[in-house]
């Protein structure tokens, strides 16, 4: 949950292609204003997905979700809450 | 803003070596199946997607990383 | 035109410090891995580093880690090499080269810049 | 770290000889090889990637085999302009080591 909450458009087209959803890519790319190449690119990326099966996509995601809520994320988290905390304050 | 092991990850996947990416994975998971599965996933990136491919791929994190949503 | 172009070589003295720069033009500068690789005089080629598109990840060859740091600025199309604590064996022509997305090699080359280390 | 060992240097041959020169890396590396081909007094070249494949613009006399720890750089016929020094470099991943060189001259 907290990962998502660093960059969710990131997580949204993330898992689009993990997923292997295409509608669901689309739609996440439209967010962002993709032009046609770059939604070509996403969509050889998603292929590879769609490929190698479930247990591929399973397996990544894994990975992903291990990375972002890790130490070297949530650190950078927990410093980023202390920054906002601190010109909250100083800004009233 | 995204965590920079994260970008870290992903510029790996897209314009580091498959040992290079697989090396970063291992990082964070070292079972043998999720790093087979990771190589088997960059080598099929690099078997798919051409030079502009991959620029593309990369303009489009960019409008990622900058946009509002993130 | 694909170019890279290198400049801050220079005559120093040992334990000395330099920075070297490298202007690209002609390409998405951003998202290209750019190498640092030397040649001594009358000697073969030598990798020293490597920095990714957004500085995620960097290497050093051993023999120049801790002393040597690459960095670069996108905004400039500008890539760097601060080195300090220079000594002799660091002598020679410096040259900055892209690395390609698609096969991971060296394919355009600037003209090299010279540093001398000597007292 | 991965060494990689370049042969022969320095190597003399006459115009319209087949030359071969090889790279052994220590361990394995997939086809990650690249040769680089540096005229006296100028910048080096990209000529042969992946160990096999030939790079945009360059010669088809120039041709690159191998995979694995043994890799060979073959000129089919030497012409007066190939005099250079010629590197191999394996690219699997950092460090991205060449081999010290094959100085190659014309008898």
């Known amino acids: 949950v907290k990962m998502a909450e660093t960059c969710p458009i990131f997580y949204d087209v993330f898992f689009a292609v993990a997923n292997g959803n295409e509608l669901l890519l689309d739609l996440s790319l439209t967010k962002v204003n993709a032009t046609e190449p770059e939604r070509t690119a996403m969509k050889k990326i998603q292929d590879c997905y769609v490929e190698n099966g479930l247990i591929s996509r399973v397996l990544d995601g894994l990975v992903m979700t291990t990375i972002s809520s890790s130490k070297d994320c949530m650190g950078e988290a927990v410093q980023n809450t202390v920054e906002d905390l601190k010109l909250n304050t100083l800004g009233r | 803003e995204i965590c920079p092991a994260v970008k870290r990850d992903v510029d790996l996947f897209l314009t580091g070596t498959p040992d290079e990416y697989v090396e970063q994975v291992a990082q964070y998971k070292a079972l043998p199946v999720v790093l087979e599965n990771a190589r088997i996933l960059k080598n099929c990136v690099d078997a798919k997607m051409t030079e502009e491919d991959k620029e593309n791929a990369l303009s489009l994190l960019d409008k990622i990383y900058t946009s509002p949503l993130c | 035109e694909v170019q890279l172009v290198e400049s801050g070589g220079g005559l120093v003295k040992p334990g000395g410090s330099l920075r070297l720069s490298c202007a690209a033009s002609?390409?998405?500068?951003?998202?290209?891995?750019i190498n640092w690789v030397r040649q001594a005089p009358g000697k073969g080629l030598e990798w020293v580093s490597l920095i990714s598109g957004s500085s995620s990840y960097i290497y050093y060859a051993d023999s120049v880690k801790g002393r040597f740091t690459v960095s670069r600025d996108n905004a400039k199309n500008s890539l760097y090499l601060q080195m300090n604590s220079l000594r002799a064996e660091d002598t020679a022509v410096y040259y900055c080269a892209r690395r390609t997305l698609s096969y991971y090699v060296m394919d355009v080359w600037g003209q090299g810049t010279t540093v001398t280390v000597s007292s | 770290d991965i060494q990689v060992t370049q042969s022969p240097s320095p190597l003399s041959a006459s115009v319209g000889d087949r030359v071969t020169i090889t790279c052994r890396a220590s361990q394995g590396i997939s086809n990650y090889l690249a040769w680089y081909q540096q005229k006296p007094g100028r910048v080096p070249q990209l000529l042969i990637y992946?160990?096999?494949t030939l790079q945009s613009g360059v010669p088809s006399r120039f041709s690159g085999s191998g995979s694995g720890t043994d890799f060979t750089l073959t000129i089919s016929s030497l012409q007066p302009e190939d005099v250079a020094t010629y590197y191999c470099?394996?690219?699997?991943?950092?460090?991205?080591?060449f081999g010290q060189g094959t100085k190659l001259e014309i008898k």
């Open positions: 992946a160990a096999s």
């Open positions: 002609g390409f998405t500068f951003r998202n290209y891995n």
């Open positions: 470099q394996k690219y699997n991943s950092a460090p991205y080591t």
